[in-house]
């Protein structure tokens, strides 16, 4: 009897991109007359269903309608592929395909991992008190949550406060703050993506006299 094989490692996709899954029968077996069901998590959560020689779009979960295409170029050789368009963070999770003939079925399971690379960090000054400079570093549009760090002139980690919010699309916005003295030198803020091993960084140079001392006078009319 044939077996079903799916992706042998997690499928990676960036938010906004298209993902592709392929399942195949081994040994090669014509699947044109079989039922092919791509599902999410559990068998009844239909991502795409092919039955009686045609797609069954009314069986799909609403969030997948209009976003899938079953590629049948190689269905006679037992290879069936699904394209899922415009990936969002909500699509991350376990997927499976179940291929069944009248008397027999097999399935394969794999994971879709979704990532989003956020913006280049923006460093701004939020305060200046007693020659201490308060810095804020902001970056948005990450998934999953990135590792955010301040680093000193020698690349050493600096202790920091961080805040994370999620936007309406489920992406993470990160803020980290830091207080340094005027002669701190080169300070960098970096955000590192957990899965992609990618890092984005911004740097600021804090000079000896960051702000020139000024005598302030009240202007009166």
């Amino acid at each position: 009897q044939w077996q079903v094989f799916g992706p042998d490692k997690p499928v990676q996709a960036l938010v906004g991109e298209d993902a592709a899954f392929s399942c195949f029968l081994s040994p090669k077996t014509n699947a044109e007359a079989m039922e092919v069901r791509f599902f999410r998590g559990q068998f009844s959560s239909v991502v795409h269903l092919y039955r009686d020689g045609k797609d069954q779009p009314f069986m799909q979960m609403p969030q997948y309608q209009g976003r899938t295409k079953l590629v049948k170029d190689s269905i006679a050789e037992g290879r069936i592929s699904l394209r899922l368009e415009n990936i969002t963070v909500l699509d991350a999770g376990l997927y499976g395909c179940r291929i069944s003939s009248q008397s027999y079925y097999q399935k394969a399971i794999w994971e879709l991992q979704v990532s989003a690379l956020g913006s280049v960090p923006l460093i701004s000054i939020t305060g200046y008190v007693d020659r201490d400079i308060q810095l804020l570093c902001q970056s948005s549009g990450w998934f999953p949550r990135p590792t955010a760090k301040w680093k000193g002139p020698q690349g050493q980690d600096l202790s920091t406060d961080s805040r994370t919010n999620r936007d309406m699309h489920g992406l993470f916005d990160v803020e980290i703050s830091l207080t340094v003295q005027e002669n701190a030198g080169s300070i960098s803020c970096s955000m590192r993506h957990a899965h992609l091993s990618r890092e984005v960084e911004s740097r600021v140079q804090i000079g000896d006299t960051f702000f020139e001392p000024i005598s302030w006078h009240l202007a009166t009319k």
Partner: antibody, heavy 121, light 106 residues
């Protein structure tokens, strides 16, 4: 052998419309998306849009939303590109092209020979 | 939309020379594909999914890159390589092509 055969050259007046065709042989156009790509003289390639011939679902590049209409007739295994309100800017070679799927990734693989459109008064 | 910028726009190379064409994307994409187009013909797939050689393409062609930076290398240029080369992102709508690099043989 897989082939995409496109209709012949067109010479039309500004303001008119034109409809060109792309017929597949050795493949079933329902099995995957069909795309159209524009190439102006001595310039690069621009993706116009695509159709899923199985259900008529289309997507267009932002520049072509109001210019192009892509349709398909599965009984004749043919995809069509209609361009309206033609101007000199639409003078170009138009290619139909077909996705190919290698098991985990997509890329364009089969291309028609191109249809040359000239818009001139 | 993702803008793909190719450089150089025109490259002149001697026979046997190794050359590298680059393609930079305005946002990160998972893969890049490369096409070769000779004068008066349809584009031909050269490299798919960043680094995979399409069927029948000589091994002197190779591709690499990730994120926003991709490249196509020809290890030893031959006369028949004179053509336009386009990078193409097939990751998100609207699909886009680079402006192309014209390779001329000295």
């Amino acid at each position: 052998e897989v082939q995409l055969q496109q209709s012949g050259a067109e010479f039309v007046r500004p303001g008119a419309s034109v409809k060109m065709s792309c017929t597949g042989s050795g493949l079933n156009i329902e099995d995957d998306y069909m795309h159209w790509v524009k190439q102006r003289p001595e310039q690069g390639l621009e993706w116009i849009g695509r159709i899923d011939p199985a259900n008529g679902n289309t997507k267009y590049g932002p520049k072509f939303q109001d210019k192009a209409t892509i349709t398909a007739d599965t009984s004749s295994n043919t995809a069509y590109l209609q361009l309206s309100s033609l101007t000199a800017e639409d003078t170009a070679v138009y290619y139909c092209t077909r996705n190919y799927y290698d098991g985990s990734l997509y890329y364009f693989d089969y291309w028609g020979q191109g249809t040359t459109l000239t818009v001139s008064s | 939309q993702i803008v793909l910028t190719q450089s150089p726009a025109i490259m002149s190379a001697s026979l046997g020379e190794e050359i590298t064409l680059t393609c930079s994307a305005s946002s990160s994409v998972s893969y890049m594909h490369w096409y070769q187009q000779k004068s008066g013909t349809s584009p031909k797939l050269l490299i798919y999914s960043t680094s995979n050689l399409a069927s029948g393409v000589p091994s002197r062609f190779s591709g690499s890159g990730s994120g926003t930076f991709y490249s196509l290398t020809i290890s030893s240029v031959e006369a028949e390589d004179a053509a336009d080369y386009y990078c193409h992102q097939w990751s998100r709508y609207p699909y886009t092509f680079g402006g192309g690099t014209k390779l001329e043989i000295k």
